[in-house]
Interface confidence: low
């Protein structure tokens, strides 16, 4: 960081005095200060000398020394006061331009720090400041009007008390410009419009801005419409409104309507589409498949999209069976409006129970009539398995019944030892039954199949297992014969364990 000599933050001298400011840095250094007369500059490598042998009030200001080569961008500063008894102010600029809500610095620098206690800011010709003018003073920089407003665009003077009288600076003109942040704000209502031929319609295009200088127009397809304009001013904004009233719409009124507004900052445009139809309509659709399969215990949301004009007069979800006569709970039915003419209706079916499989229908009604959309919900179940020992045509037979959905596949295993479930190491024999007999297969119900395994001799130290599986899961039943002999006996002499 460069160093200034003399090494004081402020220096107070009288007019006509000689002032020498020396700045030393590691590399080359540069001075920056208020534009004022009589300074001479002498640079010698890493030092730079700013000097005058005739200081005037105009030399009052902050002088900053920087080292351009310093990557940290360090600087040092000294403030010089040239206290002229006749001139308490050094005004650096006579016009200040800011945008609304910015701070406005009026650069009147005090030439004598002793005078700070008696300073004030006034409007020219001694007029007081406007109410709510919030300002602060710095002897080094001048008066700052905080968050300047357009109405504060005035001519100001800085006042100092010298020997009991007020001494004014030359005037400073403050220009506070309104911020036109962009093109006018626009609204076009409605965002979409549908009417039956012969009905009335209204389209309203409105634009607003902080500045009155803007244009707004409404166009149909590519034709600019001649519509009387209503103008208003409220909330500090200018508003212009165009209203298109159509008593009896016809097909030629349909199409794209654009509301366009422009000012010096740019142009805004927003569009809507107007549809004219011959008669009322009601369309139901779903992005989902109308045939749904869900695992028992899981949840499902059924969604129907409705496009309708005029609006719906009624709608509901109905369970059409085949199980209980329960109806969907209203709290599980939800309706959301995407826009004026499109709605989504959702039926939530959490933790589905066996009795909730079947047909669900969504019905809706408007002046165009009734429409319905029906979903078919089938529940998936993992297989349930049971095995019994019986005689069929005199032969000992193991009979396996498996029920689930989708239809289960059946595999028989014979393994050594007594076990609840055959593992690979114990397996002696495996039989796949590719075509088990279907005992029952009704819509929305489980499918029950039966597989037979004819066993001439039941081995007493072995286990027979029936396994069934489908896409949901698997189930099994192990049959353990308990017998003294090697031959088959009637079923009541055997035990089986599930």
């Amino acid at each position: 960081i460069p160093v200034i000599e003399p090494s004081v933050p402020e220096l107070v001298v009288k007019p006509g005095a000689t002032v020498t400011l020396r700045c030393v840095g590691n590399g080359s250094v540069e001075w920056d200060g208020p534009p004022s007369p009589h300074w001479t500059l002498y640079s010698d490598g890493s030092s730079s000398i700013l000097s005058t042998n005739n200081a005037t009030f105009q030399n009052t200001g902050t002088y900053r020394c920087t080292e351009p080569g310093d990557p940290l961008g360090g600087s040092a500063a000294i403030h010089l006061y040239v206290k002229d008894p006749a001139r308490p102010w050094n005004v650096l600029a006579q016009e200040v331009v800011v945008f609304e809500d910015q701070d406005a610095l009026l650069p009147c620098l005090l030439t004598d720090p002793v005078l700070e206690a008696g300073v004030s800011l006034v409007r020219v010709r001694g007029r007081p400041l406007m109410r709510h003018t919030n300002y602060s003073f710095s002897p080094w920089h001048g008066f700052t009007i905080h968050r300047a407003k357009f109405i504060q665009s005035q001519d100001y003077q800085c006042s100092a008390l010298m020997g009991g009288r007020k001494v004014m600076s030359i005037s400073i003109r403050l220009k506070v410009q309104k911020v036109i942040p962009g093109p006018p704000a626009l609204t076009l209502v409605p965002a979409e419009l549908v009417r039956i031929r012969g009905e009335a319609a209204q389209i309203v295009c409105s634009a607003s801005s902080v500045d009155v200088n803007f244009d707004v127009f409404l166009q149909h397809n590519n034709t600019k419409l001649a519509i009387p304009q209503q103008s208003d001013f409220h909330n500090n904004r200018y508003q212009k409104v165009l209203t298109l009233n159509l008593d009896q719409v016809d097909f030629q009124h349909a199409g794209n309507y654009s509301c366009v507004a422009s000012n010096v900052q740019g142009k805004h445009s927003t569009s809507m589409f107007f549809r004219v139809v011959e008669s009322a309509y009601l369309n139901l659709s779903s992005e989902q498949n109308l045939i749904q399969e869900v695992t028992v215990g899981e949840g499902l949301n059924l969604k129907v999209m409705v496009e309708a004009y005029p609006g719906l007069q009624g709608f509901n979800w109905t369970y059409l069976g085949p199980f209980s006569d329960h109806q969907p709970e209203p709290k599980l039915a939800n309706a959301t409006t995407k826009d004026t003419y499109r709605h989504t209706f959702t039926l939530s079916l959490p933790r589905l129970k066996p009795s909730e499989a079947g047909r669900y229908s969504f019905l809706a009604r408007n002046p165009g009539g009734w429409r319905a959309l029906t979903f078919e919900l089938t529940l998936r179940y993992p297989p349930e398995v049971s095995v019994i020992w019986t005689f069929i045509n005199g032969s000992g037979t193991l009979l396996c019944a498996a029920s689930g959905y989708p239809q289960p596949n059946v595999t028989w295993l014979q393994c050594s030892g007594h076990t609840d479930r055959c593992d690979e190491a114990q397996v002696l024999q495996v039989w796949d039954d590719p075509y088990p007999e279907v005992l029952s297969q009704e819509p929305f119900h489980k499918v029950t199949v039966q597989s037979l395994l004819t066993v001439e001799t039941l081995e007493h130290n072995q286990t027979y297992e029936c396994r069934a599986h489908n896409s949901v899961g698997s189930g099994s039943w192990a049959f353990i014969p308990i017998s003294a002999g090697a031959h088959t006996h009637p079923p009541d002499e055997f035990l089986f364990t599930p």
């Epitope: 942040p181 962009g182 422009s262």
Partner: antibody, heavy 123, light 107 residues
Framework: QIQLVQSGAEVKKPGASVKVSCKAS????????MNWVRQAPGKSLEWIGD????????TYNQKFKGRVTLTVDTSTSTAYMELSSLRSEDTAVYYC????????????????WGQGTMVTVSS | DIQMTQSPSSLSASVGDRVTITCHAS??????LSWYQQKPGNAPKLLIY???NLHTGVPSRFSGSGSGTDFTLTISSLQPEDIATYYC?????????FGGGTKLEIK
């Protein structure tokens, strides 16, 4: 010099929300609309919406309406973009961009851009 | 929404070549079109605004032309540092939309 500095990369789970910040410096923050644009990996640029910092007025791309919220803090010259109900297809670099002003009466373009914030949505 | 279609989607040229990229708008956008250059891992940079105006600091080898629906970006003499993806963008109306991009490579 004029610059826009954005917050760091974010990793979010589907369904969560993300809030990206954009700090402006070197110009009058309230005098220019701030826009938000995103770019999915290997894809083109997609405009999300803009905000007028002076009034807080917003305009959103209909595609994002209901999920995106643009705000500003004029005291810190910072713009924010919050996107909710995130899904994997929201994985992208999100840019803030100042709308340019060349004294033209119409036509919009983006003359200053932030460095971008990578938002990854993954379960 | 106004659709912006750029062609070609990629292009290979030699240093010193004259390169032309076109952009077509689905409806009349007057002259409210801008062009951006984006290098990998960086934010886009404005090259041209209002169809033909060169943004501050952009080399004069870049130029833009067109109005209505058809626009062109031209690089009069391709330089190695011009390798990037170029995007057009319409500023006629909300929502602002961009072209799909043209990836420019050196032969």
């Amino acid at each position: 010099q004029i610059q826009l500095v954005q917050s760091g990369a974010e990793v979010k789970k589907p369904g969560a929300s993300v809030k990206v910040s954009c700090k402006a410096s070197g110009y009058s923050f309230t005098g220019y609309n701030m826009n938000w644009v995103r770019q999915a990996p290997g894809k083109s640029l997609e405009w999300i919406g803009d905000i007028n910092p002076y009034y807080g007025a917003t305009t959103y791309n209909q595609k994002f309406k209901g999920r995106v919220t643009l705000t500003v803090d004029t005291s810190t010259s910072t713009a924010y973009m919050e996107l909710s109900s995130l899904r994997s297809e929201d994985t992208a670099v999100y840019y803030c961009a100042r709308r340019g002003d060349y004294g033209d009466y119409e036509g919009w373009y983006f003359d200053v851009w932030g460095q971008g914030t990578m938002v990854t949505v993954s379960s | 929404d106004i659709q912006m279609t750029q062609s070609p989607s990629s292009l290979s040229a030699s240093v010193g070549d004259r390169v032309t990229i076109t952009c077509h708008a689905s409806q009349n956008i007057n002259v409210w079109l801008s062009w951006y250059q984006q290098k990998p891992g960086n934010a886009p940079k404005l090259l041209i605004y209002k169809a033909s105006n060169l943004h501050t600091g952009v080399p004069s080898r870049f130029s833009g032309s067109g109005s209505g629906t058809d626009f062109t970006l031209t690089i009069s003499s391709l330089q190695p540092e011009d390798i990037a993806t170029y995007y057009c963008q319409q500023g006629q109306s909300y929502p602002y939309t961009f072209g799909g991009g043209t990836k420019l490579e050196i032969k």
